[in-house]
């Protein structure tokens, strides 16, 4: 080993990573809201739609106050990875009716990937435990029909919207604890 020498600062630190994650999450929330609205305009939903393979909502308004950094980041990363895979699946499985939304779905997937990478970087820099993201609990087969893929899209975008909404609140709260 040579004599002690300083290292130049890298591009970001954990606090900046968290700021960046908040901005990316907000941006993704706006995209998801807009895409969900487009979906409702083009393909009006007949009530709420569910997909068994989607993660259950992690947080409620009542539990926000008791959030801990490791739990929030781990759960958020696992849930967003699931949504990432569902958007991937939707793009592959989408029938002709959903092809008009392909550019928006592609952009959404790319933004999700960026956010996932930022969250993982934050967890690495903090040295928090990183659970391996599971594959979707239910294997994602092709939708039964064109209407099936539309209902799936409603469910995926609706669930992602709710997840990102609590994520923004949770991350903002965590900023005060880092």
């Amino acid at each position: 080993p040579g004599p002690p020498a300083g290292s130049p600062r890298v591009s970001s630190d954990p606090r900046a990573d968290l700021d960046s994650a908040v901005l990316l999450t907000r941006s993704l929330l706006a995209d998801t809201r807009q895409l969900a609205a487009q979906m409702r305009d083009k393909f009006p939903a007949d009530g709420d739609h569910n997909l068994d393979s989607l993660p259950t909502l992690a947080m409620s308004a009542g539990t926000l106050g008791s959030l801990q950094l490791p739990g929030v980041l781990t759960r958020l990363r696992v849930d967003l990875m699931s949504y990432f895979r569902h958007v991937q699946w939707l793009r592959r499985a989408a029938g002709p009716s959903l092809k008009t939304l392909e550019p928006e779905l592609g952009a959404l997937q790319a933004r999700l990937e960026r956010l996932l990478r930022r969250l993982q970087l934050l967890m690495s820099r903090l040295a928090l435990p990183q659970a391996a993201p599971d594959q979707p609990a239910v294997p994602l087969g092709p939708p039964a029909s064109a209407w099936g893929s539309i209902r799936a899209a409603h469910a995926i975008l609706g669930g992602l919207h709710l997840t990102l909404d609590w994520a923004v609140r949770g991350l903002l709260l965590l900023k005060t604890r880092l």
């Epitope: 300083g6 290292s7 600062r9 890298v10 630190d13 954990p14 606090r15 490791p70 990875m81 996932l116 990478r117 993982q120 970087l121 690495s124 820099r125 903090l126 040295a127 928090l128 435990p129 990183q130 659970a131 391996a132 993201p133 880092l178």
Partner: antibody
């Protein structure tokens, strides 16, 4: 400028103990997870242990589990590695590293030999 | 035996482009964990070269680039220079260890 300065290395007999320290400056130490990584002479890098930013999580490589203890004092911006029951195969340069690791110290040599 | 596999050596002439690969398993690269690359010049400490698969820290020339696909990652160095002669290591988080794992290192020789 980020600085990580290791100390405490030296020659020790098999079965002996050493405590390494790493003094950090130039960054918010309490916001970073910290690692110890070692490199045996002429060999590659081997991760040894990690401690989370607040000290609540600690993980160890199988090769040192039960013998080494990682700790930190955020008020002193200092990382520690307590090494017990040292073996010849623990001979290496020990690096203190922060974050991904993003930053590395220059290392301190630990020689275990009779 | 390293958990991440790298070729032990690589070489190229000045100006050339060289690529170093890094392959992993289901508990690290394959599990969507990001890959980081380090450069270790002779007699010095490792230095972060690429993080999060493809991001460059400030001060790292854009001749260095990283990418990841599936269970493997790669580091590309274009416009090779004599000062690039060093050992290069890939690293990724490993869920089975709850810590980072390193590749065995690749010794790059500039001919």
């Amino acid at each position: 400028e980020v600085q990580l300065l290791e100390s405490g290395g030296g020659l020790v007999q098999p079965g002996g103990s050493l405590r390494l320290s790493c003094a950090a400056s130039g960054f918010t130490f309490s916001s970073y997870g910290m690692h110890w990584v070692r490199q045996a002479p002429g060999k590659g890098l081997e991760w040894v242990a990690v401690i989370s930013y607040d000290g609540s999580y600690k993980y160890y490589a199988d090769s040192v589990k039960g013998r080494f203890t990682i700790s930190r004092d955020n008020s002193k911006n200092t990382l520690y590695l307590q090494m017990n029951s040292l073996r010849a195969e623990d001979t290496a340069v020990y690096y203190c590293a922060a974050g991904v690791p993003d930053y590395w110290g220059q290392g301190t040599l630990v020689t275990v030999s009779s | 035996q390293s958990v991440l596999t790298q070729p032990p050596s690589a070489s190229g002439t000045p100006g050339q482009r060289v690529t170093i690969s890094c392959s992993g398993s289901s508990s690290n690269i394959w599990s969507d964990y990001d890959v980081h690359w380090y450069q270790q010049l002779p007699g010095t400490a490792p230095k972060l070269l690429i993080y999060s698969n493809e991001e460059r820290p400030s001060g790292v020339p854009d001749r260095f680039s990283g990418s990841k696909s599936g269970t493997s990652a790669s580091l590309a160095i274009s416009g090779l220079r004599s000062e690039d002669e060093a050992d290069y290591y890939c690293a990724a988080w490993d869920s089975s260890l709850s810590g980072p794992v390193f590749g065995g290192g690749t010794k790059l020789t500039v001919l």
